[in-house]
Interface confidence: medium
């Protein structure tokens, strides 16, 4: 399987709500043994390998706001945590999946992966993720509402396995 | 710079509880698992457990399970190997190191310097 | 468990010469999904921790000079130290990561001929 990024910058206004999105490509093993997560977490640019670097969302991390399921399956996170700090992860029956970040700031700019593991049961991990930036702007330059700007080709179908 | 900073070397007697640490710094503790690894003397590399910082879960060799206890406080970015009642087989090296897994068991890409434990009556 | 096993337990080479470490599996580790092995390698100097050199079984982990290489697939791994340097005298461990408990192998000392 692959996961794909629609969009690779995101550029919003202080203050506005957005949703960064993701796409898992590609069959998935649907095995009894075999489970299924999506998840997201910050990281930075510059590193040898993007995304290899994990950092929270407003605190929360990658096991705070993951989903588990068997594949592609609906499923949100309804938790108080995550919507305690204005953020909600979801994802839909064709594998799409998204993570919405409400009454963005300054201080949420900065790159964002979404990441899918598939683990069989007593084995190690099978991960692919997609990364996307987010650029949150105040001033008179400022948009209205986010502009999104599409992935090249290339780009949404860099896919990293690790 | 991510840092692993472990407590420094023990001497006990046999019976003795004992609880080691390991403090993280330079990356984000709460998104890294933490393993330990035995090294007895002049011996190789044993993989003893895991912890999740971020929620305290926790996976053990089934070689160490039930004689040692995994733990770790997220407030100040440290995990802990403890024993209850310590033998002298226990005399070893132990070192933490951060593995690299989302939900449990990798590569281990940074140690800390290790924590002699001897224990002799 | 997954055993891991060294060949040889020491070697001996000349500065400048290849040095080759054996690892063998109980069972293959390599993982279907993603046609990976969940394989590492580890070096470890006197009196010091372990370092990560390898991982993926050939992927050098970040400033690791590039005289180290990883090499095999399934259950048959091989580290190569193409020109033994001073500093590389350590013990080498391999590690797989495809299933817990995580398994180490015995170690093979290399030290200069």
């Known amino acids: 399987f692959k996961v794909a990024t629609p969009y690779s910058l995101y550029v919003c206004p202080e203050g506005q709500n957005v949703t960064l999105t993701c796409r898992l490509l590609g069959p998935v093993d649907k095995g009894h043994d075999v489970t299924f997560y999506k998840t997201w977490y910050r990281s930075s640019r510059g590193e040898v390998q993007t995304c290899s670097e994990r950092r929270p969302i407003r605190n929360l991390t990658f096991q705070d706001l993951h989903l588990h399921h068997g594949g592609h399956q609906a499923a949100n996170t309804s938790h108080d945590l995550a919507q305690r700090h204005g953020l909600e992860s979801a994802s839909d029956h064709h594998g799409n999946f998204s993570i919405t970040m409400r009454n963005l700031t300054l201080l949420d700019s900065g790159l964002y992966c979404c990441l899918v593991v598939e683990i069989r049961h007593h084995h190690s991990e099978h991960r692919v993720h997609g990364a996307m930036e987010l650029q949150v702007q105040t001033g008179k330059d400022a948009p209205s509402n986010c502009v999104v700007y599409p992935s090249s080709s290339q780009d949404s179908e860099n896919i990293t396995a690790a | 710079e991510v840092q692993l900073v472990q407590s420094g070397a023990e001497v006990k007697k046999p019976g003795e509880s004992l609880k080691i640490s390991c403090k993280g710094s330079?990356?984000?503790?709460?998104?890294?698992?933490i393993g330990w690894v035995r090294q007895m003397p002049g011996k190789g590399l044993e993989w003893m457990g895991i912890?999740?910082?971020?929620?305290?879960?926790?996976r053990y060799s089934p070689s160490f399970q039930g004689q040692v206890t995994i733990s770790a406080d997220k407030s100040i970015s440290t995990a802990y190997l403890q024993w209850s009642s310590l033998k002298a087989s226990d005399t070893a090296m132990y070192y933490c190191?951060?593995?690299?897994?989302?939900?449990?068991?990798?590569?281990?890409?940074?140690w800390g310097q290790g924590t002699l434990v001897t224990v002799s009556s | 468990d997954i055993v891991m096993t060294q060949s040889p337990d020491s070697l001996a080479v000349s500065l400048g010469e290849r040095a080759t470490i054996n690892c063998k599996s109980s069972?293959?580790?390599?993982?279907?999904?993603?046609?990976?092995?969940?394989l590492a390698w580890y070096q470890q100097k006197p009196g010091q921790p372990p370092k990560l050199l390898i991982y993926w079984a050939s992927t050098r982990e970040s400033g690791v000079p590039d005289r180290f290489s990883g090499s095999g697939s399934g259950t048959d791994f091989t580290l190569t130290i193409s020109s033994l340097q001073a500093e590389d005298v350590a013990v080498y461990y391999c590690q797989q990561y495809y299933s817990t408990p995580l398994t180490f192998g015995q170690g093979t000392k290399v030290e200069i001929k």
């Open positions: 069972q293959s580790v390599l993982y279907s999904s993603n046609n990976k092995n969940y």
């Open positions: 912890i999740y910082p971020g929620d305290s879960d926790t």
């Open positions: 330079g990356y984000s503790f709460t998104s890294y698992w």
């Open positions: 190191a951060r593995d690299d897994a989302l939900y449990g068991g990798y590569y281990l890409d940074y």
